[in-house]
């Protein structure tokens, strides 16, 4: 059995109340594909949502989050409060990262500092709430005889001043 509605173009619907002729989507509705028997209601960007793209007869509205919030989920289905760097969002609001953790973004959770010793390296720059530690070369890299891009400076004997 052939679908008599299959050729109704996007932006229209196949109107069963009018003998299956194509009718335009009513205001505030859309159909993004052809052959639809109904049009979908346009998404409304209200409250913490703001409109990024208006609804048209062939495509849904697209939302963003207002300032101080960021999108979560497919097609920005939720807005979550921003926090400062060095914080994470909890049920009680934004909280500072615990010692030994950091967050360098306005969203997400605090993550543990890198454990430099796991890679046999030393801590070159200490971590903060906002930044991870910076690992330096391993102690072995600093020992005499280790290959290096620049040769080590010659050792001076005690009591001798530079020439």
């Amino acid at each position: 059995l052939q679908d008599l509605c299959s050729n109704c173009p996007a932006g229209t619907f196949c109107d069963n109340n009018r003998s299956q002729i194509c009718s335009p989507c009513p205001p505030n509705s859309f159909s993004s594909a052809g052959g639809q028997r109904t049009c979908d209601i346009c998404r409304q960007c209200k409250g913490v949502f703001k409109t990024r793209k208006e609804c048209s007869s062939t495509s849904n509205a697209e939302c963003d989050c207002i300032s101080g919030y960021h999108c979560l989920g497919a097609e920005c289905s939720m807005c979550e409060q921003d926090c400062k760097q060095g914080q994470e969002l909890t049920k009680k609001g934004c909280k500072d990262c615990c010692f030994g953790t950091f967050n360098d973004q306005k969203r997400g959770i605090c993550r543990p500092w890198t454990n430099c010793s796991l890679d046999g390296k030393s801590v070159l720059v200490n971590g903060t709430k906002e930044r991870d530690v910076v690992c330096g070369p391993s102690p072995a890299d600093l020992s005499p005889g280790a290959s290096s891009a620049t040769p080590p400076a010659p050792a001076r004997e005690p009591g001798h001043s530079p020439q």
Epitope: Q2, N7, C8, P9, R18, Q20, I21, C22
Partner: nanobody, 118 residues
Amino acid sequence: QVQLQESGGGLVQPGGSLRLSCAVSGFSFSINAMGWYRQAPGKRREFLAAIDSGRNTVYAVSVKGRFTISRDNAKNTVYLQMNSLKPEDTAIYYCGLLKGNRVVSPSVAYWGQGTQVT
């Protein structure tokens, strides 16, 4: 409500030409397919030509090359240009609003009243 009104029929000599018009109202013309049909005395109604919203056309073998269907969306009108007319073209000619913008295996949702071609 949906209305379709044919005009342009009349008496014509063999080999002559006629242009039929079908003015429509009561629906969104530009997004729907339209068709032309005819019914000769004592015969079944016969499909002649159809045109969809994208101006794709389909013709019956009996009229292909002689008849041309076209549409003017600004005027909400569909036309049938008939050339090299023959005595067997005598019939009442009807325009039809087709279901679902289909020109392949079309099905008519609404008919006009018809215009006589002799």
